[in-house]
């Protein structure tokens, strides 16, 4: 299953099969997601380990049993690969490093006014995988507002330094902001020019494309069919790249079929994961296991669940069936292709679902109508989650955020359906970010069912929480994708990076703004937060944010949004905003439902028809 | 409309026990907190104790810890303060008062008289 | 614990005059005061809380400021309904009150 716990001062011992540097433990694990082997990794900070050369060293790291040794190392930060973790995985990696120089091959320079602006010129340059910027307090005046952008063979930084008033970080393409576009078409009987980075067998030029969107060098690919006229080249896939970033030449091939990376696709990439099942055709590679089971569904649900089966062949021969059930080879290779394609066989073949977003139906659960002030505008994916309530009368309007916490689930505020319980009038918006893009033609979802606590009362803060059941699932993309729960009861968590998101006023007596809005909350102790509020009993049921100077809150029209709060590289949802005196105001924090109280609740109502649960808690 | 309604007033013998009732009304007494306050003859407040009584944890002034327990009922949206072992120096008016951080909404008072 | 100390324990005004109370708590209370007035025979009524503000429906010539230890309450034009004895409250750890405060019309 998914482990999401990292372990701080441990390093695994062995098991290794790839190293590199980045900047954080998060990007380490990501890249250990990824790797085809990797089921573990430990990275060393800066701080941890005198000798330079492994500073910022990410080490990956397989091991048969699905564990390995754990050796003290203070500093050093150990966890588990994130696959079969469903919607965590991304190769999104937002963060920008203050005071590290990330290293690499430097092949575009130019003057910019702010680290955000060399992000995303790096994002709309074809070739750049990370980029550094010197800011303006750099020590050589020369230098100051340089923006560097880098590349490198594997796609992680060569070495990454210390260095003072410099800025990394790496290119938003795999988070489908890049502003380049994409080339969807494929060419039939056309074969691409150019330098080969990497080479792997697969049964179709969409694997071969899947494949090269997050390969960090290939730009376009070619593909070789399994009739192609040289038999040991039949099924191969070739990864290219170029100077320019596109193919020198293309020439007209039988049997061949070319097409390009689709990580320049702006607002929606391929799943990491290839979900088809190919009929007749066997995957050669190294034997992990050999199951019994019936039919070749289940055989892929078997490799999916077993964490380091890459692809499988289900095997139809009558030698290898017993009654109903049939042999399920699960296998696996270096690069997690299959080593060998046959075809006109007897069997089906396919691969595991591990790194597919969707993953099964679950969801890592690792007064006043309330309301932002004082905040600043989000970016496209940044609060994936996060989604607009509107009620749709005479006019359409903006009433409330909520969170998705599920294919069909949306956590919100039981208080947003105070005199509006019709489920008819509802609209919910998800994977939006400008309130004005909506138009009649914005896909919406409709709600089946609308779940209020069954202890709320119509003008009290207690109990404030309510589940909106959607008429249809939706997919998982880098722009709409759930938020995971809190564990049950979970108290012991110290949460000090929490912010608070949604379209709602930005002063006491304002309107609702068009972008949505965030901003950073600290959290403040219930026995302080009582104090501020003379009248309203602060339950262990409800959580406070809120500076003591006030200025930055939430406001009229963010009830039911989230708050979240990232802890060990992950945002969890802490609380759901409920009430509070006015907005943003001197020593009123914002009060929020807490969801770690309400845990069993959710848990309970998300059940679906069958018993099984629609969510679960992180171990 | 919020009120908390006292039963009252009570003449007892030193040594004796009493039980005072706040009632409330317009407010489930779940929703909030119960405070007690005593006020003796021509002196100012002291703060008792106070009960949360959707859980009947409670708070109470160190000094007096063991002469005074607090109960609620939900049931009957009643909160209780029982005294213990009177003296003359417990003759005073007894209030109740509800409120988060502090107390907001007060009842009438009972007066309680120690006398042999 | 913590004590506040109020004074003066009386004082005699004119309507239309100026009234000031102050009240030293023995530990900072982080601003965690409030003040209450209470007329003969009534329950005492919450004026001001977290030192300076208003409780909704008090009016506007009621006051209160300080911070750390010492604290004031004001009443910028005093008038004949205001006649009461007015207590301070500590609330910062548990509850202490002052020992009052009455106001008489000269």
């Known amino acids: 299953g998914c482990l999401t716990q990292l372990y701080e001062n441990a390093f695994f011992r062995g098991g290794d099969v790839a190293s590199m540097y980045t900047p954080n433990a998060q990007y380490c694990q990501m890249r250990c997601t990824f790797h085809p082997r990797c089921l573990l990794f430990s990275f060393l900070p800066a701080s941890s380990i005198n000798d330079m050369e492994k500073r910022f060293g990410c080490f990956l790291k397989d091991s048969v049993t699905g564990t390995l040794p754990k050796v003290h190392r203070t500093g050093a930060v150990s966890g588990h690969s994130l696959k079969q973790c469903g919607h965590q995985i991304s190769a999104c990696h937002r963060d920008i490093y203050k005071g590290v120089d990330m290293r690499g091959v430097n092949f575009n320079v130019s003057k910019v006014s702010s680290v955000e602006e060399c992000q995303k010129r790096c994002t709309s340059n074809i070739r750049c995988q990370f980029f550094s910027y010197a800011t303006q307090t750099f020590h050589k005046a020369e230098y100051r507002n340089n923006c560097l952008l880098k590349y490198s063979p594997g796609g992680t930084p060569t070495a990454i330094k210390v260095l003072s008033n410099v800025e990394s970080g790496f290119s938003l393409k795999p988070c489908a902001l890049s502003e380049i576009g994409c080339h969807m078409n494929i060419f039939q009987h056309l074969a691409f020019s150019d330098v080969d980075v990497a080479r792997v067998l697969t049964p179709d030029a969409f694997v071969c494309r899947t494949i090269c969107t997050y390969h960090p060098n290939c730009l376009f690919f070619t593909f070789y069919t399994n009739v192609w006229k040289i038999e040991s080249q039949r099924n191969v896939c070739l990864l290219k790249t170029s100077e320019s970033g596109t193919p020198s030449s293309s020439t007209p091939q039988e049997n061949t079929i070319s097409g390009y990376s689709l990580l320049t696709c702006k607002r929606t990439l391929p799943e990491p994961c290839h979900s088809k099942i190919y009929p007749g055709v066997d995957f050669g590679g190294e034997e992990l296991n050999v199951t019994f089971v019936k039919g070749v569904n289940v055989c892929q649900e078997t490799c999916t669940k077993m964490i380091r089966c890459q692809f499988f062949t289900y095997s139809l021969l009558p030698e290898d069936c017993k009654e109903e059930k049939c042999k399920c080879f699960l296998r696996l290779s270096m690069d997690g292709s299959p080593t060998r394609i046959a075809y006109g066989t007897q069997g089906s073949s396919g691969y595991s679902l591990r790194l597919c977003n969707t993953g099964d139906n679950s969801v890592c659960t690792t007064k006043t109508s309330t309301r932002i002030v004082g905040g600043t505008n989000s970016s496209w994916g940044e609060w994936p989650w996060q989604v607009s309530l509107q009620v749709k009368l005479t006019a359409q309007r903006h009433l409330c955020g909520g969170s998705l916490i599920g294919h069909q689930w949306v956590l919100t505020a039981a208080h947003c359906f105070d005199g509006l319980p019709l489920q008819d009038v509802w609209r919910i918006y998800s994977g939006i970010l400008n309130l004005s893009d909506i138009t009649k033609d914005t896909p919406f979802s409709q709600i089946k069912e609308i779940i209020i606590h069954q202890n709320y009362k119509v003008s009290e803060g207690n109990h404030d929480i309510a589940l909106i059941k959607l008429q249809a699932p939706l997919n998982y993309t880098e722009f709409q994708k759930p938020i995971c729960l809190p564990s049950k009861g979970d108290t012991s968590t110290i949460y000090t990076n929490c912010w608070v998101t949604g379209w709602g006023f930005s002063k006491e007596k304002g309107e609702i703004q068009n972008i949505l809005q965030k901003v950073n909350i600290p959290l403040v102790t219930n026995e302080e937060c009582q104090k501020r509020y003379q009248d309203y009993k602060i339950t262990q049921r409800m959580v406070c944010a809120g500076y003591k100077e006030g200025g930055k809150d939430a406001c009229k029209g963010d009830s039911g949004g989230p708050l979240v709060c990232k802890h060990n590289g992950m945002w969890r949802l802490v609380g759901i905003t409920s009430w509070g005196e006015g907005c943003a105001r001197r020593e009123q924090p914002g009060v929020y439902t807490k969801v770690a109280e309400y845990m069993d609740w959710i848990l309970e109502k998300t059940q679906s028809s069958d018993g099984k649960a629609q969510m679960q808690s992180p171990a | 409309e919020v009120q908390l309604q006292q039963s009252g007033a009570e003449l007892v013998k030193p040594g004796a026990s009493v039980r005072l009732s706040c009632t409330a009304s317009?407010?489930?007494?779940?929703?909030?907190?119960i405070f007690w306050v005593k006020q003796r003859p021509k002196q100012g407040l002291e703060w008792i104790g106070r009960?949360?009584?959707?859980?009947?944890?409670?708070k109470y002034d160190p000094k007096i810890q063991g002469k005074a327990t607090l109960t609620a009922d939900t049931s009957s949206n009643t909160a209780y303060l029982q005294l213990s072992s009177l003296t003359s120096e417990d003759s005073a008016i007894y209030y109740c008062?509800?409120?988060?951080?502090?107390?907001?909404?007060w009842g009438q008072g009972t007066l309680v008289s120690v006398s042999a | 614990d913590i004590q506040m100390t109020q004074s003066p324990s009386s004082l005699s005004a004119s309507v239309g005059d100026r009234v000031t109370i102050t009240c030293e708590a023995s530990?900072?209370?982080?601003?965690?005061i409030a003040w209450y007035q209470q007329k003969p025979g009534k329950a005492p009524k919450l004026l001001i809380y977290?030192?300076?503000t208003l409780q909704s429906g008090v009016p506007s010539r009621f006051s209160g400021s300080g911070s750390g230890t010492d604290f004031t309450f004001t009443i910028s034009s005093l008038q004949p309904e205001d006649i009461a004895t007015y207590y301070c409250?500590?609330?910062?750890?548990?509850?202490?009150f002052g020992q009052g405060t009455k106001v008489e019309i000269k």
């Open positions: 008062a509800k409120g988060g951080g502090l107390f907001a909404y």
């Open positions: 317009g407010f489930n007494i779940k929703d909030t907190y």
């Open positions: 009960i949360d009584p959707e859980n009947d944890n409670t």
């Open positions: 530990h900072d209370i982080n601003n965690y």
């Open positions: 977290y030192t300076s």
């Open positions: 409250l500590q609330y910062d750890n548990l509850f202490t």
